[in-house]
Interface confidence: medium
């Protein structure tokens, strides 16, 4: 029987810079029954707090609300392990939420085939941003990715759409279908999932080349 | 037939400033991303920025961020690059091309040489 | 440090075939961003040879083409001629710059 390993936080995300969550592994166990707490204070303050919702998240998780976000305020943070044998601490993480916002995947994709009759036919992508993301603030530029390709190929083909919220391409094979997919990530941040697979058709008289 | 053509290069002193602009026919100029790429004598092609085709989004290379600022002029069909703050390192042949679809630049102009230098 | 690295240069006889490599990293090509192929002629402004990894533009001779594979893409170019002797650059969108990246160019020459 031995005291606790020590933890690790390992990850924090916030789905739009109003709420936040932090993981973290457990060391070993000891052999004995072990609690788990995480401590934090704001940076320029010497106030310890304990975490605010540990049920939110998950196991070994914690939560922070609202009314514990601050996206102007660096968060410093610790997780304590605890057994009948003694503590450990994890490392000290810094969290500042700007840096951590992992949207949800962009919503409302919709794929379609246009054909001019003066130009060449193309594919007209478009898409709307999740719905936690308040883009009126101008506290987010959100950016886009699109990816696409024939059902049966192995590789995709990925686009950087920038801030825009609809795309075109030009030359796709005639006849096949294909699958196309879109994410976003704040500028600060991580890439969400890919949303769902839209699949379309591709005529078989779609012009291939300029 | 499409075509665009710069102007506005010069001789400019270190911190000096300068406006490119690029003429654009040929084609509807206000359907389409433009881009504005520079070559440094006997160097390869670095890209500086680019803007969509109402002037909503813009991006810039790290190198020139906070010191040139692209905008366009849909009812005049040019693009333009302000160019402040400049250093000896600016010095190159800067292009404006068209950004077809995956913003690949698809047709370009000739040039124009801007020179910063003491 | 995000580069697309080529080869500075490449030679051929005419009626050869040469291929120019570009080799990125998982923050540009292995990520999955296109490329595309410019040609630049002596004295002339750059040119659109292949876009989308392996699409020519109408007007660009099939003797050119293009091809990607993990974290690199190649420019084939057979039949070669005269014509031909150009700088050739690669170019990608790079996730970690948020920007256009362009290879430091290949000098094709036609012996």
């Known amino acids: 029987q031995l005291p606790p390993g020590k933890p690790e936080i390992f990850k924090c995300r916030s789905p739009n810079k109003e709420t936040f969550t932090c993981w973290w592994r457990p060391g070993t166990d000891g052999g004995l029954p072990t609690n788990y707490s995480l401590t934090y204070h704001r940076e320029g303050e010497t106030l310890m707090h304990e975490c605010p919702d540990y049920i939110t998240g998950g196991p070994n998780s914690c939560h922070f609300g609202k009314q514990y976000t601050s996206m102007w305020r660096t968060y410093i943070m610790m997780v304590n392990a605890t057994n009948q044998m003694g503590s450990s601490f994890s490392d000290e993480l810094y969290v500042d939420v700007t840096y951590i916002v992992q949207p949800d995947p962009p919503l409302e994709l919709a794929v379609e085939v246009k054909q001019p009759e003066d130009r060449k036919p193309y594919l007209w992508i478009k898409w709307s941003p999740p719905t936690l993301i308040d883009l009126k603030t101008g506290w987010f530029t959100l950016l886009y990715e699109i990816r696409l390709k024939p059902e049966k190929a192995a590789e995709w083909e990925i686009h950087f759409a920038g801030q825009q919220t609809e795309f075109k391409i030009l030359s796709l094979h005639p006849g096949q279908k294909y699958l196309v997919q879109v994410r976003c990530k704040p500028d600060h941040g991580y890439w969400s999932a890919w949303s769902p697979a839209t699949f379309i058709q591709i005529p078989s008289d779609f012009t291939m080349n300029d | 037939e499409v075509q665009l053509l710069e102007s506005g290069g010069g001789l400019v002193q270190p911190g000096g400033s300068l406006r490119l602009s690029c003429a654009a026919s040929g084609f509807t100029f206000s359907s389409y991303w433009m881009h504005w790429v520079r070559q440094a004598p006997g160097k390869g092609l670095e890209w500086v920025s680019d803007i969509s085709s109402a002037s909503s989004y813009t991006n810039y290379a790290d190198s020139v961020k906070g010191r040139f600022t692209i905008s366009r002029d849909n009812s005049k069909n040019t693009l333009y690059l302000q160019m402040n703050s400049l250093r000896a390192e600016d010095t190159a042949v800067y292009y404006c091309?068209?950004?077809?679809?995956?913003?690949?630049?698809?047709?370009w102009g000739q040039g124009t040489l801007v020179t910063v230098t003491s | 440090q995000s580069v697309l690295t080529q080869p500075p240069s490449a030679s051929g006889t005419p009626g050869q075939r040469v291929t120019i490599s570009c080799t990125g990293s998982?923050?540009?090509?292995?990520?999955?961003?296109?490329v595309h192929w410019y040609q630049q002629l002596p004295g002339t402004a750059p040119k659109l040879l292949i876009y989308r990894n392996n699409q020519r533009p109408s007007g660009v001779p099939d003797r050119f083409s293009g091809s990607k594979s993990g974290t690199s893409a190649s420019l084939a170019i057979s039949g070669l001629r005269s014509e031909d002797e150009a700088d050739y650059y690669c170019a990608a969108w790079d996730d970690s710059l948020n920007g256009w990246l362009f290879g430091g160019g290949t000098k094709l020459t036609v012996l």
């Open positions: 998982s923050s540009n090509i292995g990520y999955g961003y296109v």
């Open positions: 091309a068209r950004g077809l679809d995956a913003r690949r630049m698809d047709y």
